[in-house]
Interface confidence: low
């Protein structure tokens, strides 16, 4: 009679061990879900990589999706010729062919009337003659020294395409446009059994008030940086470079007591880019100490270790950093299969199986 | 409120003249350039002529350059277009518009158009 358990003592070991098996299975639940944040200067790259996870991990844009970036398509391209016409009147360049400076004023007249999501041909004529003016092309080659979308040659290449009437954005299309992110953008996907949950956060400085102090929890943070700014100055106060800006950033985060066992991963973006700008812009632009060549992996080496020597604990955090291109699908699908590794692996460490 | 109020257009024979004003109120006047821009029938807007704030530069298409005049008042809020020897092709409702650089950021101030046609 001793050994024998009542009903409600059986009833109470029952709960006992659904307790225990409620809580294991929270616990494995949570350890499968990915908290990322997604943070850096304005223009580095993060809602890039958002839309490329989109791509890669959800069965990317639908055609309707696709149609509804028309109007962002066109924008953009309008934007980017206006803003290489605008500079040309402040950089003291002149239209190869003085006939362009009527198309110039048309442009104007054109871009103020089109109807959103609309390119008439008229426009498009008007743009294609504009960008292969031979004192246009020499405005943008001088882009560093204002304010010019990365995409702006991609789109305005490729204006015979974007400004049919049947024309619908592609994918890639689609991961070039660019719209200024305001507040905090939030998206799921699942990958290798984890389930990630990515916040885009706005990265001009008057966003950042929104965010600083408010993701605990965060398991890692992605954070960019365009390696290609190593030459342009900082469009919100235009005395700052972009990169001393970036690193200033990064410091604070990297730094933060918020953060301290948060994976901290550096995507050195826009390598594309900088591989191009490298050519003909010294590094000592940024960094005039810099004495070494100016090769695209001596000089990408240094920023990384501009970036990396900013970590002031380097003996319990680890700073995991990549090269990336986040317009390139393939670059950003391998990159995002070693970051996630280096997820699971740190998971595994925090719950004392590795 | 932003208003720009042409007037001067009508029916002239080719090689006649006309003079276009525009009247501006709701705002300072005298800190913006300003500009003729005209669209014919079935076309799309076409920039004509511009002039600085202060009536100092003046720009104007190949196709009216030695016929059109563009000028201002500010003491009195107006803009004019002087057209001399017009030309059939120079028929089509004529608006008067703040500075290019307002346009595509989609604050551009344009008046409702006066018309002119050239006919014989």
């Known amino acids: 009679m001793g050994c024998t358990l009542s009903a409600e003592d059986k009833a109470a070991v029952e709960r006992s061990k659904m307790i225990d098996r409620n809580l294991r299975e929270d616990g494995e639940k949570a350890a499968r879900e990915v908290k990322l944040l997604l943070l850096g200067a304005g223009e580095s790259g993060k809602s890039t990589i958002v839309k490329q996870m989109k791509i890669i991990h959800e069965a990317g844009y639908s055609e309707e999706e696709c149609k509804q970036y028309k109007a962002v398509v066109y924008s953009n391209t309008i934007q980017s010729i206006i803003a290489i016409i605008r500079a040309m009147g402040r950089l003291k360049i002149d239209f190869g062919d003085s006939a362009r400076a009527d198309d110039a004023r048309q442009l104007f007249v054109l871009a103020g009337a089109a109807e959103e999501g609309f390119m008439t041909a008229e426009l498009a004529g008007v743009i294609k003659r504009l960008w292969k003016d031979s004192g246009v092309q020499a405005c943008f080659n001088r882009s560093r020294e204002y304010q010019l979308n990365d995409s702006a040659a991609y789109y305005l290449n490729d204006l015979d395409r974007i400004a049919q009437p049947n024309y619908i954005p592609t994918q890639q299309d689609v991961l070039r446009t660019r719209v200024k992110t305001t507040g905090i953008v939030e998206t799921h996907f699942t990958f290798k059994d984890l389930h990630f949950k990515m916040f885009d956060v706005g990265g001009q400085r008057s966003e950042r008030k929104k965010w600083i102090h408010c993701f605990e929890g965060v398991t890692a943070i992605i954070f960019c940086v365009a390696l290609s700014d190593y030459d342009l100055v900082l469009a919100e106060d235009e005395e700052m470079n972009r990169m001393h800006e970036s690193m200033k950033l990064f410091d604070s985060i990297c730094n933060n007591k918020w953060f301290t066992d948060t994976s901290i991963i550096l995507f050195l973006n826009k390598k594309d880019l900088f591989e191009e700008k490298i050519k003909k812009s010294p590094l000592t632009i940024c960094y005039p100490e810099y004495a070494g060549s100016n090769t695209y992996e001596e000089a990408a080496a240094y920023i990384q270790c501009q970036f990396e020597d900013l970590n002031k604990r380097k003996d319990t955090k680890e700073i995991y950093t990549h090269f990336t291109c986040a317009t390139d699908t393939k670059n950003v699908q391998f990159v995002f299969d070693a970051v996630t590794d280096v997820i699971i692996k740190n998971n595994l460490k925090d719950c004392g199986l590795f | 409120e932003v208003q720009l109020v042409e007037s001067g257009g009508g029916l002239v024979q080719p090689g006649g003249s006309l003079r276009l004003s525009c009247a501006a109120s709701?705002?300072?006047?005298?800190?913006?350039?300003m500009n003729w821009v005209r669209q014919a029938a079935g076309k799309g807007p076409e920039w004509v002529a511009s002039i600085s704030s202060r009536g100092i530069t003046t720009d104007y298409a190949h196709s009216v350059k030695g016929r059109f005049t563009v000028s201002r008042d500010n003491t009195k809020n107006t803009l004019y277009l002087q057209m001399n020897s017009l030309k059939p092709d120079d028929a089509a409702v004529y608006y008067c518009?703040?500075?290019?650089?307002?346009?595509?950021?989609?604050?551009?101030?344009w008046g409702q158009g006066t018309q002119v046609t050239v006919s014989s």
């Open positions: 709701g705002f300072t006047f005298d800190d913006y350039a």
């Open positions: 518009a703040t500075d290019p650089s307002t346009w595509y950021r989609g604050t551009a101030h």
